[in-house]
Amino acid sequence: SGTTNTVAAYNLTWKSTNFKTILEWEPKPVNQVYTVQISTKSGDWKSKCFYTTDTECDLTDEIVKDVKQTYLARVFSYPAGNVESTGSAGEPLYENSPEFTPYLETNLGQPTIQSFEQVGTKVNVTVEDERTLVRRNNTFLSLRDVFGKDLIYTLYYWKSSSSGKKTAKTNTNEFLIDVDKGENYCFSVQAVIPSRTVNRKSTDSPVECMGQEKGEFREI
């Protein structure tokens, strides 16, 4: 039947950051098209990206319905122009993805330092609470909304004039640190979920330094 001119997808890979979730696979299609299905362990299969020549499919809308569920996807291969054709077993070729639990596995996006303010020998550094694509009551939730107590931030800070870094941690989105008077400091933050075994840390935020626009200095 139709197996001779289709090949099964392979290297199915989840790419996910802050719950924006895309399934990628190989190979680039030659005379074939793909359809993706996604399901929870106990749910029904839902088809997405019908008869596409792409080798990726955005599944964000499905996984954000419950980011703590475990999902499985599969990619079906069909002959181009003859999508009714099936394999020898009476159904199209398909390949399963690895299981994916967004809450435990989505990458943490690069955080951004929203502001810093110096008051005397204290600096308050605020991390932007990034919006995710997870919704509740028609509102997009922030990273903090979704991860709650599981999310912490690490601050790296150092004097502009030296390379010795100090660190601080917070389970909110704000740091209050002691600094030496008259010294300029630079800051970078990292999002961390300590309870994870994979994808525990984000990449570091862009460095922000005192004496630049983002901060505010007040002599008290």
């Epitope: 639990t101 809450y103 939730l141 979704v146």
Partner: antibody, heavy 120, light 109 residues
Framework: QVQLKESGAELMKPGASVKISCKAT????????IEWVKQRPGHGLEWIGE????????NYNEKFKGKATFTADTSSNTAYMQLSSLTSEDSAVYYC?????????????WGQGTTLTVSS | QAVVTQESALTTSPGETVTLTCRSS?????????ANWVQEKPDHLFTGLIG???NRAPGVPARFSGSLIGDKAALTITGAQTEDEAIYFC?????????FGGGTKLTVL
């Protein structure tokens, strides 16, 4: 629906160890913290610690470090708490509870409790 | 370790509004303490009412609400009913551990 079912009552001798189980059904076990809580008459509730089954990550009340050990088996959706070197102070009712952490954070489901009696 | 303090007992009448509070020995309670409120009824029946300071659990009547009042977490029952007679525990999160309060015995008569 979400349910937590704990193992039955235990009568143990001082110095022994006991393993209490908490079987979860109705949700993705790996993604939610399981909390362990102790209740003694006149002592209110005491938090022992928590485990996230999907990663095995744990947090303990300092007071119970060395006393309690948490494990979880994701294939059977069961969390365990082992209590060692038992004394009469360990006689209590022990509960597991699911912590629905995040934007709808609450201890939303509780086990029925396991009564532990330590007596010689 | 922090100490979490609740009123030991309160009495109210059906239809009245009553507020239970939860104080932290370390200072003001904030949203990052993820205040939880749990109800205990006879025979070890526990129900999670409120979490994350003000999120009501599914199935919990709308008369129960959580908030921050001054430097404390609060549970308000607007229009108490006789079936609300129970012990109410709060729990606060401190970076890597929960601490329960001693519980408030609420009598409705």
């Amino acid at each position: 629906q979400v349910q937590l079912k704990e193992s039955g009552a235990e009568l143990m001798k001082p110095g022994a160890s006991v393993k209490i189980s908490c079987k979860a059904t109705g949700y993705t076990f790996s993604s939610y913290w399981i909390e362990w809580v102790k209740q003694r008459p006149g002592h209110g509730l005491e938090w022992i610690g928590e485990i996230l089954p999907g990663s095995g990550s744990t947090n303990y009340n300092e007071k119970f470090k060395g006393k309690a050990t948490f494990t979880a088996d994701t294939s059977s959706n069961t969390a365990y708490m082992q209590l060692s070197s038992l004394t009469s102070e360990d006689s209590a009712v022990y509960y597991c509870a699911r912590d629905r952490n995040g934007y709808v954070n609450y201890f939303d489901s509780w086990g029925q409790g396991t009564t532990l009696t330590v007596s010689s | 370790q922090a100490v979490v303090t609740q009123e030991s007992a309160l009495t109210t009448s059906p239809g009245e509004t009553v507020t239970l509070t939860c104080r932290s020995s370390t200072g003001a309670v904030t949203t990052s303490n993820y205040a939880n409120w749990v109800q205990e009824k006879p025979d070890h029946l526990f129900t999670g009412l409120i979490g994350g300071t003000n999120n009501r659990a599914p199935g919990v009547p709308a008369r129960f609400s959580g908030s921050l009042i001054g430097d404390k977490a609060a549970l308000t029952i607007t229009g108490a009913q006789t079936e609300d007679e129970a012990i109410y525990f709060c729990a606060l999160w401190y970076s890597n551990h929960w601490v329960f309060g001693g519980g408030t015995k609420l009598t409705v008569l």
